[in-house]
């Protein structure tokens, strides 16, 4: 049986997710991110809450965080643009755009991911891919290589049940099943990819992982298309 990796997942195929980014603070992995344009990485706003004094960088082209790889490159951040409505105490609007110090060098292992612009819910039960370097077990073990898991989308009504997230899931958020397979701490800011398209970003609120009554929460990128476009313009 799977031994964690994300939670309940496995090691990803190396460099098969060329859009995948590691947002780093003082040289250590902090959050996931996704390359959405040559010079822009999308992540979660809460990731930078405690990063005021540290150096934020973005690692692209990586599979292993520690091993040398020809495609790996660490980029400085020119500017960080959190969504203007994001707040420390809510999961709403939990998006962050990071402008790299220069355009990323694109290649087979570094390439932006198309993101969903049609503001329509993903059908429940659709299997979506989540990847990250987040913890792989409840003891908090961090992987060196990228992990991934396929998760079914959960309908909003179920996710909003009193026993689950009790009405907190707005139309700008979506949920995925969390029954032993789940995204977890350190995966925040990473991509939820459905049918090869970016549909969601892992929110960075504190949440118990792998408990089916507490589904994973993801920010729907299509709901923020106007904001993303305005920042990237």
């Amino acid at each position: 049986p799977p031994r964690g990796r994300i939670l309940g997942g496995r090691e990803a195929e190396a460099h098969a997710r060329p859009y995948m980014a590691s947002v780093q603070l003082n040289g250590a992995h902090l959050c996931g991110g996704v390359l959405v344009a040559e010079q822009w990485v999308l992540s979660a706003a809460h990731c930078l809450e405690d990063a005021a004094d540290g150096k934020v960088q973005v690692l692209l082209g990586a599979h292993s965080l520690s091993q040398p790889e020809p495609s790996k490159r660490l980029y400085d951040v020119l500017r960080a643009v959190p969504h203007p409505d994001s707040q420390p105490d809510t999961i709403d609007h939990d998006l962050l755009l990071l402008q790299l110090s220069e355009k990323a060098t694109l290649g087979p292992a570094v390439r932006p991911l198309p993101w969903q612009r049609v503001d329509r819910d993903v059908a429940p039960g659709t299997l979506c891919d989540v990847a990250g370097w987040g913890i792989v077990n409840h003891a908090g073990r961090r992987p060196d290589s990228l992990q991934h898991v396929l998760l079914p989308v959960l309908d909003r009504a179920t996710c909003n049940r009193r026993t689950h997230h009790d009405g907190a899931i707005t139309e700008r958020l979506m949920c995925a099943e969390s029954n032993r397979r789940d995204s977890c701490k350190g995966d925040s800011g990473g991509p939820l990819v459905c049918g090869g398209v970016l549909e969601g970003v892992v929110t960075s609120g504190s949440r118990v992982c792998g408990n089916r009554k507490k589904p994973g929460i993801y920010t729907r990128v299509a709901s923020y298309a106007a904001w993303i476009d305005s920042v990237l313009a």
């Epitope: 049986p1 309940g8 098969a16 989308v153 049918g195």
Partner: antibody
Framework: EVQLQQSGPELVKPGASVKISCKAS????????MHWVKQSHGNILDWIGY????????SYNQKFKGKATLTVDKSSSTAYMEIRSLTSEDSAVYYC??????????????WGTGTTVTVSS | QIVLSQSPAILSASPGEKVTMTCRAS?????MHWYQQKPGSSPKPWIY???NLASGVPARFSGSGSGTSHFLTISRLEAEDAATYFC?????????FGGGTKLEIK
């Protein structure tokens, strides 16, 4: 390479139920979703649903809700599909299929051998 | 649900010819998968995510397309290519297949 071995052909009477099996050849059975697909006469392929052997989470095509039930036995690395209230419309070849890769572009890279179900009085 | 329509239903061509079959979706699909099936056998993965050849698939096959129109092309037809080809979308549950294109060799 992983193989999915399905149970043999079934001849069943209308109104009855049938349970067909799909056994994975390797021991990483719980790591991968198991899907079921119906191929009826005229070669039409219909996705029935999937089950996650790791946690029992399943999803069905609305068309097959109440008709098919998916289960697994982790100890024998076997997935099952039960089809109830059989009619001639259920006569078909049924396949289990899975994705054993780890890229984000999942597809059915492994298919079972197929089980022919014939409904006839 | 997303409906996939394949055309032509039957395609007859001679060895060495270039052939293209089409899969049209009722709504936009970013990536399409294709499977090959020969009589009496299970379907085989053939092209995944629109343009990637599955393991063991000859380089004369290619896939292309975006949105609602996707294509499978064989640059130089060979006798062993006779089969039925199905497209499949995986963007949205329920996952759906096209009705198939039966490729016959003259």
């Amino acid at each position: 390479e992983v193989q999915l071995q399905q149970s043999g052909p079934e001849l069943v009477k209308p109104g009855a139920s049938v349970k067909i099996s799909c056994k994975a050849s390797d021991n990483s059975f719980t790591g991968y979703y198991m899907h079921w697909v119906k191929q009826s006469h005229g070669n039409i392929l219909d996705w029935i649903g999937y089950i996650d052997p790791y946690n029992g989470v399943s999803s069905y095509n609305q068309k097959f809700k109440g008709k098919a039930t998916l289960t697994v036995d982790k100890s024998s690395s076997t997935a099952y599909m039960e089809i109830r209230s059989l009619t001639s419309e259920d006569s078909a070849v049924y396949y289990c299929a899975s994705y054993y890769g780890s890229s984000p572009y999942w597809y059915f890279d492994v298919w079972g051998t197929g089980t022919t179900v014939t409904v006839s009085s | 649900q997303i409906v996939l329509s394949q055309s032509p239903a039957i395609l007859s061509a001679s060895p060495g010819e270039k052939v293209t079959m089409t899969c049209r979706a009722s709504s936009s699909v970013s990536y399409m998968h294709w499977y090959q099936q020969k009589p009496g056998s299970s379907p085989k993965p053939w092209i995944y995510a629109t343009s990637n050849l599955a393991s063991g698939v000859p380089a004369r096959f290619s896939g292309s397309g975006s949105g609602t129109s996707h294509f499978l092309t064989i640059s130089r037809l060979e006798a062993e290519d006779a089969a039925t080809y199905f497209c499949q979308q995986w963007s949205s549950n329920p996952y759906t297949f096209g009705g198939g294109t039966k490729l016959e060799i003259k």
